[in-house]
Structures are given as C-alpha cells and as structure tokens.
C-alpha cells in the first residue's frame, strides 16, 4: 500500500511513460492534506510496481476516467450476480417446497 504521508508528499517524481488501463491493478487518489497540499495519484500495476502519476496530465485524467468507469462496471456486475444468486436460491427453495408437498 502507498505510504502514509507524514512529513512530505509521496510523489517526488511522476511516471515518465504512459500507463495503460490493462496494466492497472489499483489506482488511489489522495486528497490534499496537512502533510501534502496537493492531489497525488498512485497507481499499482499488475506486476506489483507502484508509481506516481501526474494529476495535471491529460493522459492521466483520461486514465482515471477509464479506471472509474471500469470499477463502476465491475460493481454493477457484482451486484447483478448477487441478484441472480438470490433468484436461484428462491427457485431452489420453491422447488424444495413443491417436492415436499408432492411426497
């Protein structure tokens, strides 16, 4: 996990290259705080490497949008699956009750 910001900002430099959505494992945004008066964005890549991203970069802003969209889609999918499971359980329960009645 990224460092707890105590006496300084975590991001002294920011990534020199382009980060692709496919390589992202996690993306954390830190709001300004007493220890660091600016927004900081720390990406964790799928290979485990953590890197800082420049909040002012157009590419980074686009990446954040895509990441947030992906996260919300995953949440929707999860919720949908939960909903489906509940339906299946209800069906199974009703089937069992029918079976009990017929025996």
């Amino acid at each position: 996990t990224p460092v707890v910001r105590k006496g300084r900002c975590s991001c002294i430099s920011t990534n020199q290259g382009t980060i692709h959505l496919q390589s992202l494992k996690d993306l954390k945004q830190f709001a300004p705080s007493p220890s660091c008066e600016k927004i900081e964005i720390i990406a964790t890549l799928k290979n485990g490497v953590q890197t800082c991203l420049n909040p002012d970069s157009a590419d980074v802003k686009e990446l954040i949008k895509k990441w947030e969209k992906q996260v919300s889609q995953k949440k929707k999918q999860k919720n949908g699956k939960k909903h489906q499971k509940k339906k299946v359980l209800k069906v199974r329960k009703s089937q069992r009750s029918r079976q009990k009645k017929t025996t």
């Epitope: 991001c11 430099s13 920011t14």
Partner: antibody
C-alpha cells in the same frame, strides 16, 4: 541520451552569494523530482535539497535551510540552487541528480558531473 | 532526523570474494525508501539499488540488496575489479532530511 550538466561554480568569499544551474536533457524534466547533493573534499555525500516535479514542494537539509533556495524552470528544463550567506563549510562539489522516475520508490538514478564551489577569503 | 550508520568503514577483500555491507538506521525506514550507491574516485555516484532490494537499470545481478526496518544489507556476490569503490546507503524517510550513510570503502586486499 539522459544528461545533467551543472554550471555556476567558482571561488567566492564568505558571506557572498552564488547561483548554480543544472541543464537537463533526454528525459521529461517536468515529471522529475530533482536534488542537489554535495561532497566536501575527501568527505562523504551530503544531501542538500529536493524539489518536486511540479515545483510545489521543496525540502532542505538543516545545514542550508534559510540560506539556500532550490527552484526550477520546467519550460527551460533547468534546475537552480541559489546559495546565499556562504560559509567555508559550504566548500564542496555540488551535484544535481534526478529522482527515480517512477516517483513512488526513491533513489537518484541520473547524476551530473558536478560543479566545484570554493568559499574562501 | 534519521541517522544512518554503515559498517565496516573499510572492507579489504580480493576479487572473486563476497562482500557484505551493512547499513543501520536510527529509526525504522520504509523499504521503499532505502537506496544504495557506488562512487569511484573523481566520478559522480551511481544508483545501484532502490526500494531496498530492486536493482537499478544496467546493474549486474551480482549486486543485491535486502533488509527492512532498521537493518539493510548490500551484498556483492563475487567482487570484480571494477567493484572496488565507496558504497553509500541513503534513506528517504517520511520527512526530510534524506540522509546518506558515511560510506563503506571496499578496497583490494
């Protein structure tokens, strides 16, 4: 190729000022945190100052705090160290160095060749 | 302020031997924030290890870093003639100054 070139060193009297420059090339300067590190003759390395990639954050060693100012001009790809109220103990080779480019882990991965500052009356 | 102590001050070894250099911090340092450098006479330092154990670009695999908390180690598995130099550890704690250790000189026995 990735390069840092310091300039501005010289002989100066105690109490006077000097400004060091560090010209960067071959990498995205505006993404890079930059340091000044010095080495007195026959001694070890001493970290002097650091400026964040965007120039917002500056950090200093206690020995130079209030006397030295680190700054940068991202449009010119140049780092500066303004040294005021110089003392004999500031005599050293001054290196500029780039902070590790990933930003999260730290280390100085590119160094200049150094510029010599001699404070003497 | 975090103070770094390096030991030994000087290490006299022969080419082909294993070198073990120690760096001890006065307070705990995050592993992400410990680096090792090599410096040869008349040259600028060179980054060897960052994040306590990750080799910098172009650094041979005979160099390795380890440790956490207050105790860190740089190991050179088999010394090559070009490895005889001064080695410094440096910490980037949660607040400045980002101090260097006093250095360990590895010289030829």
């Amino acid at each position: 190729q990735v390069q840092l070139v310091e300039s501005g060193g010289g002989v100066v009297q105690p109490g006077r000022s000097l400004r060091l420059s560090c010209a960067a090339s071959g990498f995205t300067f505006s993404n890079s945190g930059m340091h000044w590190v010095r080495q007195a003759p026959g001694k070890g390395l001493e970290w002097v100052a650091l400026i964040g990639f965007d120039g917002i954050n500056e950090y200093y060693a206690d020995s130079v705090k209030g006397r030295f100012t680190i700054s940068r001009d991202n449009s010119k790809n140049t780092l500066y160290l303004q040294m005021n109220s110089l003392r004999a103990e500031d005599t050293a080779v001054y290196y500029c160095a780039r902070d590790w480019p990933e930003g999260y882990y730290n280390g100085m991965d590119v160094w200049g060749q150094g510029t010599t500052v001699t404070v003497s009356s | 302020e975090i103070v770094l102590t390096q030991s030994p001050g000087t290490l006299s070894l022969s080419p082909g031997e294993r070198a073990t250099l120690s760096c001890r911090a006065s307070q705990s340092v995050s592993s992400s924030y410990l680096a090792w450098y090599q410096q040869k006479p008349g040259q600028a330092p060179r980054l060897l290890i960052y994040g306590a154990s990750s080799r910098a670009t172009g650094i041979p695999d005979r160099f390795s870093g380890s440790g956490s908390g207050t105790d860190f180690t740089l190991t050179i598995s088999r010394l090559e003639p070009e490895d005889f130099a001064v080695y410094y550890c440096q910490q980037y704690g949660s607040s400045p100054p980002f101090t260097f250790g006093p250095g360990t000189k590895v010289d030829i026995k």
